[in-house]
Interface confidence: medium
Amino acid sequence: SAPGEDEECGRVRDFVAKLANNTHQHVFDDLRGSVSLSWVGDSTGVILVLTTFHVPLVIMTFGQSKLYRSEDYGKNFKDITDLINNTFIRTEFGMAIGPENSGKVVLTAEVSGGSRGGRIFRSSDFAKNFVQTDLPFHPLTQMMYSPQNSDYLLALSTENGLWVSKNFGGKWEEIHKAVCLAKWGSDNTIFFTTYANGSCKADLGALELWRTSDLGKSFKTIGVKIYSFGLGGRFLFASVMADKDTTRRIHVSTDQGDTWSMAQLPSVGQEQFYSILAANDDMVFMHVDEPGDTGFGTIFTSDDRGIVYSKSLDRHLYTTTGGETDFTNVTSLRGVYITSVLSEDNSIQTMITFDQGGRWTHLRKPENSECDATAKNKNECSLHIHASYSISQKLNVPMAPLSEPNAVGIVIAHGSVGDAISVMVPDVYISDDGGYSWTKMLEGPHYYTILDSGGIIVAIEHSSRPINVIKFSTDEGQCWQTYTFTRDPIYFTGLASEPGARSMNISIWGFTESFLTSQWVSYTIDFKDILERNCEEKDYTIWLAHSTDPEDYEDGCILGYKEQFLRLRKSSVCQNGRDYVVTKQPSICLCSLEDFLCDFGYYRPENDSKCVEQPELKGHDLEFCLYGREEHLTTNGYRKIPGDKCQGGVNPVREVKDLKKKCTSNFLSPEKQNSKSN
C-alpha cells in the first residue's frame, strides 16, 4: 500500500481543529501578474511581498507594483506601497535584502527614459520606513552588500562604471570605469575585471583583475590576460589566457591575489569552460568541460591549497557555460554530494559521494520500489534523482532535491528507480541517513519543505488543477496526514517557509480565478499546536553518521573522524524549537592511506592506495608544475585530504623532493606577455 495508509500509522490527534485555528488567509487586492517574496532578517517574522502587473500598450509597457509587509510570518499583510510613493519597482533586480539581521532592504525603481540616473528606496528598519534616493547612474545589477558591513554597497552601471556607497546607498561614488564584473571579497575588499580597449566581450581574455581594499581609494593589479574570475571559500580563481594560443588555464590564490599558482588542471579552449561547483575553506570541486559540444566534463577535487587536483568523476553532466548541472551539496550530512553523469548510451544516471568526492557510487535502490522499464535486470537497479537538468528539460519535476543542515540526515528528492533517469512521472523519495538508504515517500510529483529542523515535513501535490489540500508528516515522511486548508481550491504557485527550516509556519501561495478577475492569495498555516510540547532528552536518540558496518572499529569514519548525532525519534511528536542546535559528538579516527591524496608529481596506480612518483615529468605534465613561493615546490608525495582530521595510524613520510629540478612552470608572468598590443 502507499506510504501513509498503513495500519501502523498513528494519526496526530485533533489535527484538523488545531490547524484550522492556525490557518490565516490573505487575499491581495491585485490583478495577477508576478509575485516575489523575501524574508527580512532571521527569526523576525518579517516578509516583503512585491506584486507587479504589466499592461503592454501599443507604444510602451505600463507597469504597476504593490508592496506588502508581514511581521507575523505571513499570517497578516499590510499594503505599504505608499511608503515607496506608489513607484513601479523593477522585479529583475528583486529585493536586495541586507546580510545577517541588518534589517536593510533596497528596492530599485523603474524610471522614465530621459532620467539622469536610477532611483532606489532604502530601508534600514526591516521595511517599516523607506527613503527615496536618486542615483547618479543607471544600475545594471542589483546592489551588492559587503558581507562584512551592510552599509557598504556596490553596483555596476549600464555604462560599465563601478559605483560604491559607504552609507547604505545615500551617496554614491564611481570608483572605476570600464568594469565587467565586480565581487566583494573578505574584509570589504572588492575584486573586479576591467577592459582597456573595446568592451567586456571584445576584451575577454585581455581583461585585468584589480583589487581595492579601501573602497576605491587605492588599487592593485593582481591579474593580466584574464578571461574571468571567481571566489570560492578562501580561494580566488582566475582563468588566464595562455601566451601562444586561445587556451586558458586556472590560476589560484589564497592571499587575495598577492601571489598565484597554476592549478594542476587541464587547459580549456574557446568553447569550453571551468565551473566551481562547490568550495569551502578546505577545498574546491571544479568542473572542467570536455572539448566539443558533449554536455559533460570531469569533476576534480582540490588539495588544501587549491593547486593539486585529483580526478573525482568522469562524464559529469553539465550542459553549457551557465547551463545546467545536477551537482548538489547534501547539507544535512558532511561529505555528501549528489550529481548526474551522462553514460555512453546518452542516458543520465545519478551518482553519490559520501567522502567529499573520493569515491562515487550509484544510489541504493529503495526497498519499497520496483525497477522501472529502464532497468535491464528487474532485480538490480538504482535510484536516480531529478535535479536542475530535469527541471530545465520541463519534466514533471516541480522541485530540486532538498536538505537542511539542521535536519540531520534528511534528503528529499524526486526520482525514478531503474538504470537511468526516466522521463516518466517521478515519485518523491526520502533518505534519513544522508543518502545511504532511500524510501518512497510520496506517489507522484510534489512540492515539499522541511519545518522545525525536520520535526515536520510538508508537501503539496503538483497538479495543473486547483488544489486545497496540504499533506504533512511528523515522522520523517513515513506517515502522512492530509488537511484541507480552504473550501475554495486555488491555482497553486509555491510554498514559502522561512529559510533555515526552523520555522513552524508554511505559506501556500496561489491565485483564484473568477469570470472577470484573478487575485493573489496566500494561506499561512502554523503547525505549533500540532507539536504541542517541547522535545525533551528522551525524544532524542544517538545516531552514528556514515555507519555502514557496525562491527568495524572504523565504522562511520569519513575524512578522518566520525560523528554521533542526537536525532529526534520518528515516534516523537514534539517541537525542536527555533533555538534547536544540532548536538554532535566527533571522534578522531586512525589515519590510513585513504586519508591522503597524491601530491603533484605522484600518482596512484589502479587498485593501489600507495602514491608512486611519476617516472618523469615531460610533455603535457610540464604545464602542471607549481609556481610561486618556495614551499609550493616541495612535496613528500602525499598530502592530507582537505578537512581530514585523522591522527596516528599510517603516516606516509617521504623524503622531500625539490620539483624545481624536474620542471619549470609556464605560469603567466608579465615578462611573458606578448609585446604586441591587444
Epitope: 593589479t221 598565484w260 609585446s675 604586441k676 598590443s677
Partner: antibody, heavy 124, light 107 residues
C-alpha cells in the same frame, strides 16, 4: 643597452596642454609598465600614473585624473604623457620610468630604468 | 593614499660612516618598498627593491630591511659618491607614493 629617451624641454602658457614622449630601446617594450613621475623644483618625487604598453591599461593618480592621458605606440616603442589645462604649479621635470618586472602580477618592484627627464615650464 | 614618512629629512656624515635612513608607511605594505638615490640634475636610480633585494649593479654597501610599516636603508660605509638625496617608495597599491626624501650631506 636598455634606455629611455625623452623629448625636449617645453615652455607652455597656463591652460595649454603638453605632450611628452618617451622612446624605449634595448628591451621588449610591451613587457614592462611605463610609469610617469614628476619633480617640481626643489621638491620630492610625485607619481602620476602608469600605462601597460602591452594592453593599453592605464592607472592615474587621483590628483591628475581628468587632466592626464597616457598612451603608447607599440610600433615605435614609445610612450606618451599628455597633461592638459596646465597651471603654473605644473612646472616640473617629468620623468618616464620603466617598472621593474616581478615574476608575479604586480605594479611594483620599483622603477629600474629612468628617462633623462623633460623640463616643462608653465608661465604666462 | 598611503603616506610615506622618511626620517631624518637630512643628515651630515663623513666618508666611512655607517648611515641609516628610516621610512614608515601609514599602513602595512608587506615588503613592497623600494629605495632610490638621486643626485642633483639627474634622474633617480633604483638601489633596493622589495625592501631588501639589491638592484644589479648597486654596490653591496647598500642594504635594506623591514616589512609591514617600518623599513630601513643602511649604507655600511659611506663613500664620496653616496652624497645624494634618498627616497623610499611604496608599490603595494596605486597610487604609488614616495617619501619626502633624506638629503645626505658631507660633514
Amino acid at each position: 643597452q636598455v634606455q629611455l629617451v625623452q623629448s625636449g624641454a617645453e615652455v607652455k602658457k597656463p591652460g595649454a596642454s603638453v605632450k611628452v614622449s618617451c622612446k624605449a630601446s634595448g628591451y621588449t617594450f610591451g613587457a614592462y609598465y611605463m610609469h610617469w613621475v614628476r619633480q617640481a623644483p626643489g621638491q620630492g618625487l610625485e607619481w602620476m600614473g602608469w600605462i601597460n604598453p602591452n594592453s593599453g591599461f592605464t592607472r592615474y593618480a587621483q590628483k591628475f585624473q581628468g587632466r592626464v592621458t597616457m598612451t603608447r605606440d607599440t610600433s615605435i616603442s614609445t610612450a606618451y604623457m599628455e597633461l592638459s589645462r596646465l597651471r603654473s604649479d605644473d612646472t616640473a621635470v617629468y620623468y618616464c620610468a620603466r617598472g621593474k618586472r616581478s615574476s608575479g602580477w604586480y605594479e611594483g618592484y620599483g622603477m629600474d630604468v629612468w628617462g633623462q627627464g623633460t623640463t616643462v615650464t608653465v608661465s604666462s | 593614499d598611503i603616506q610615506m614618512t622618511q626620517s631624518p629629512s637630512s643628515l651630515s656624515a663623513s666618508v666611512g660612516d655607517r648611515v641609516t635612513i628610516t621610512c614608515r608607511a601609514s599602513q602595512s605594505i608587506s615588503s613592497y618598498l623600494n629605495w632610490y638615490q638621486q643626485k642633483p640634475g639627474k634622474a633617480p636610480k633604483l638601489l633596493i627593491y622589495a625592501a631588501s633585494s639589491l638592484q644589479s649593479g648597486v654596490p653591496s654597501r647598500f642594504s635594506g630591511s623591514g616589512s609591514g610599516t617600518d623599513f630601513t636603508l643602511t649604507i655600511s660605509s659611506l663613500q664620496p659618491e653616496d652624497f645624494a638625496t634618498y627616497y623610499c617608495q611604496q608599490s603595494d597599491v596605486s597610487p604609488i607614493t614616495f617619501g619626502g626624501g633624506t638629503k645626505v650631506e658631507i660633514k
